[in-house]
Interface confidence: medium
C-alpha cells in the first residue's frame, strides 16, 4: 500500500533570483486530481491553494508581488489527493538580489586569453560581506562561491573554449540576500592548444565549490518545468 504520493516539482518564474521589489511566482506541479497544495517557507506553512476543478489542474502558482529579504529563503510544496499526501518537493532557494551595493568584477590576465592560460576572476565589494558569488550565464549556469573581506578570487585554472561566456558576480549578505549584480565581463578564449572538441559544454569544477543551477534563461525557456527543477541548488545548502 502506497503511503505517500510522488513529490511535486517546484520552481520560480521568471527566476529564482529576484530583484528587490519585483514580482515572482512560485510554481508547484503535482498530479491531476490533487485537491490541495501547500507551500511551506522555512519549514512553516506559508500558503494553501485548492484548485478547481482538481481533475483538470496539476499545477498551482503562488504569486509574490513584492520581493524582499523577508521572503527570501527555502520553499517547498506538497499536495494531497483525497486523504493521501505527497512527499515534499525538493527545496527551492529563493534569492533576493539588488540589495545594497554593486560589486566590481575584473579578470586577470584579461578578458581575451588563449586556451590553456590560467584565468582568475576578482569580485570586489567594499561593504559588509565576506561571501561572493560568480555566475556564468548560460542554459546550465554555474555558480562559484568565494570568500574574502572585501574581495574574493575565483581561479578558473587553465581555461578551454568551454569557459567562454559572460560572467557576473554578486556579494552575498546571507545565503538568500545578494547584492546588485556586477557589470558583466565577457571572457573570450581563443586558440587550440588542446582538443577543444572534447571539452564539455560546461567545464567541470571542484565539487566543493560548484553547484549546478538549472536556470530558465531568456534564450532557453523550457516549457516542461518538470525538467527545470530549480532545486538542484546545492550551493545554498
Amino acid at each position: 500500500q502506497q503511503q505517500t504520493l510522488p513529490k511535486p516539482f517546484i520552481w520560480a518564474e521568471p527566476h529564482f533570483m529576484v530583484p528587490k521589489e519585483k514580482q515572482v511566482t512560485i510554481c508547484c506541479q503535482g498530479n491531476y486530481g490533487a485537491v490541495e497544495y501547500q507551500l511551506h517557507f522555512e519549514g512553516s506553512l506559508f500558503a494553501v491553494d485548492r484548485p478547481k476543478p482538481p481533475e483538470r489542474i496539476n499545477k498551482v502558482q503562488f504569486y509574490i508581488p513584492d520581493m524582499n529579504s523577508r521572503m527570501a529563503g527555502q520553499y517547498s510544496c506538497i499536495y494531497r489527493v483525497g486523504e493521501l499526501w505527497s512527499e515534499p518537493s525538493n527545496l527551492l532557494d529563493l534569492v533576493v538580489t539588488e540589495m545594497y551595493d554593486t560589486p566590481t568584477l575584473s579578470v586577470h590576465p584579461g578578458p581575451e586569453v588563449i586556451s590553456g592560460e590560467k584565468v582568475t576572476f576578482y569580485c570586489r565589494l567594499d561593504t559588509a560581506t565576506s561571501m561572493f558569488l560568480l555566475l556564468k550565464e548560460g542554459r546550465s549556469s554555474h555558480v562559484q562561491r568565494g570568500y574574502g573581506k572585501v574581495q574574493a578570487e575565483f581561479p578558473l585554472g587553465p581555461v578551454t573554449t568551454a569557459h567562454r561566456g559572460t560572467y557576473r558576480c554578486f556579494g552575498s549578505y546571507n545565503n538568500h540576500a545578494w547584492s546588485f549584480p556586477s557589470e558583466p565581463v565577457k571572457l573570450l578564449v581563443t586558440g587550440d592548444i588542446e582538443n577543444t572538441s572534447l571539452a564539455p559544454e560546461d567545464p567541470t569544477f571542484p565539487a566543493d565549490t560548484w553547484g549546478t543551477y538549472l536556470l530558465t534563461t531568456e534564450t532557453g525557456l523550457q516549457k516542461d518545468h518538470a525538467l527545470w527543477d530549480h532545486t538542484a541548488q546545492n550551493l545554498l545548502r
Partner: antibody
Framework: QMQLVQSGGGLVQPGRSLRLSCAAS????????IHWVRQAPGKGLEWVSG????????GYADSVKGRFTISRDNGKNSLYLQMNSLRAEDTAVYYC???????????????WGQGTMVTVSS | DIQMTQSPSSLSASVGDRVTITCRAS??????LAWYQQKPGKAPKLLIY???RLESGVPSRFSGSGSGTDFTLTISSLQPEDFATYYC?????????FGQGTKVEIK
C-alpha cells in the same frame, strides 16, 4: 519610513455607523494585505478584519460579520473599515496593521497604525 | 478558531534577569507564530515571526523557539525598556488569534 496613519475614530451612539481610515506610506501598499485589530480598554488584542493585497479577498471575525466592511483603494494607498450597527462591545482602540509578507501569506503584522479610539455609548 | 494560551499572565522580574514566556496553541500551527511587545498607550511592536525569526531592528536578547503547539519567548537579560505586555499570535490560519498577554513588571 514605512508607516500607517489612522483617522476617523470618536464617540458614537449604539446602532449608528462610523468609518475608519488608514493611510499608508513608505512601502508598496498595493502588494500587502492589511488588517484591522482592536483592543478593548484593559483587554488583549482581537483580530477584526483583513483584506488581501489586491482587494480580492476579505475576512471578518464572527463578532463583526455582517456589520463591518473592509475595503481598500490602492490608488490612494488607503484602507477603510465601515462599521455599521455599532454596539457597546465594539468600544476599543482600533489598529490597522500591515502583513509582514507581500501577497497573501503569513498574517504576522510588522507595521501598525497609531490606533484610533472608538467609543460606543448612549 | 485556534485558541492561544499564554503563561504566566504576569510576572515580576529585575533588570538583568532571564525571562521566559510560553504560549500554547489548541492545535498544531507548525511554526506560524509571532510575538509582539506592547507598551501602555502604544501600538504593538513585532519582535519575532515564524516562531524564531527576529524582526529587523529588534535586539538579539529576544529569541523565540518552538513548533507545533508549544512556543517560548525568551529575554536573555531584561532591560529597563523591556517592561511591557507581550502577546503571541498564530498566523497559521484565519482568523489569526492572539494570546491573552503576559505583563512583565519591575520587581
Amino acid at each position: 519610513q514605512m508607516q500607517l496613519v489612522q483617522s476617523g475614530g470618536g464617540l458614537v451612539q449604539p446602532g449608528r455607523s462610523l468609518r475608519l481610515s488608514c493611510a499608508a506610506s513608505g512601502f508598496t501598499f498595493s502588494s500587502y494585505g492589511i488588517h484591522w485589530v482592536r483592543q478593548a480598554p484593559g483587554k488583549g488584542l482581537e483580530w477584526v478584519s483583513g483584506i488581501n493585497w489586491n482587494g480580492g479577498s476579505t475576512g471578518y471575525a464572527d463578532s463583526v460579520k455582517g456589520r463591518f466592511t473592509i475595503s481598500r483603494d490602492n490608488g490612494k494607498n488607503s484602507l477603510y473599515l465601515q462599521m455599521n450597527s455599532l454596539r457597546a462591545e465594539d468600544t476599543a482602540v482600533y489598529y490597522c496593521a500591515k502583513r509582514a509578507y507581500s501577497g497573501d501569506y503569513y498574517a504576522a503584522f510588522d507595521i501598525w497604525g497609531q490606533g484610533t479610539m472608538v467609543t460606543v455609548s448612549s | 478558531d485556534i485558541q492561544m494560551t499564554q503563561s504566566p499572565s504576569s510576572l515580576s522580574a529585575s533588570v538583568g534577569d532571564r525571562v521566559t514566556i510560553t504560549c500554547r496553541a489548541s492545535q498544531g500551527i507548525s511554526n506560524a507564530l509571532a510575538w509582539y511587545q506592547q507598551k501602555p498607550g502604544k501600538a504593538p511592536k513585532l519582535l519575532i515571526y515564524a516562531a524564531s525569526r527576529l524582526e529587523s531592528g529588534v535586539p538579539s536578547r529576544f529569541s523565540g523557539s518552538g513548533s507545533g503547539t508549544d512556543f517560548t519567548l525568551t529575554i536573555s537579560s531584561l532591560q529597563p525598556e523591556d517592561f511591557a505586555t507581550y502577546y503571541c499570535q498564530q498566523h497559521y490560519s484565519t482568523p489569526p488569534t492572539f494570546g491573552q498577554g503576559t505583563k512583565v513588571e519591575i520587581k
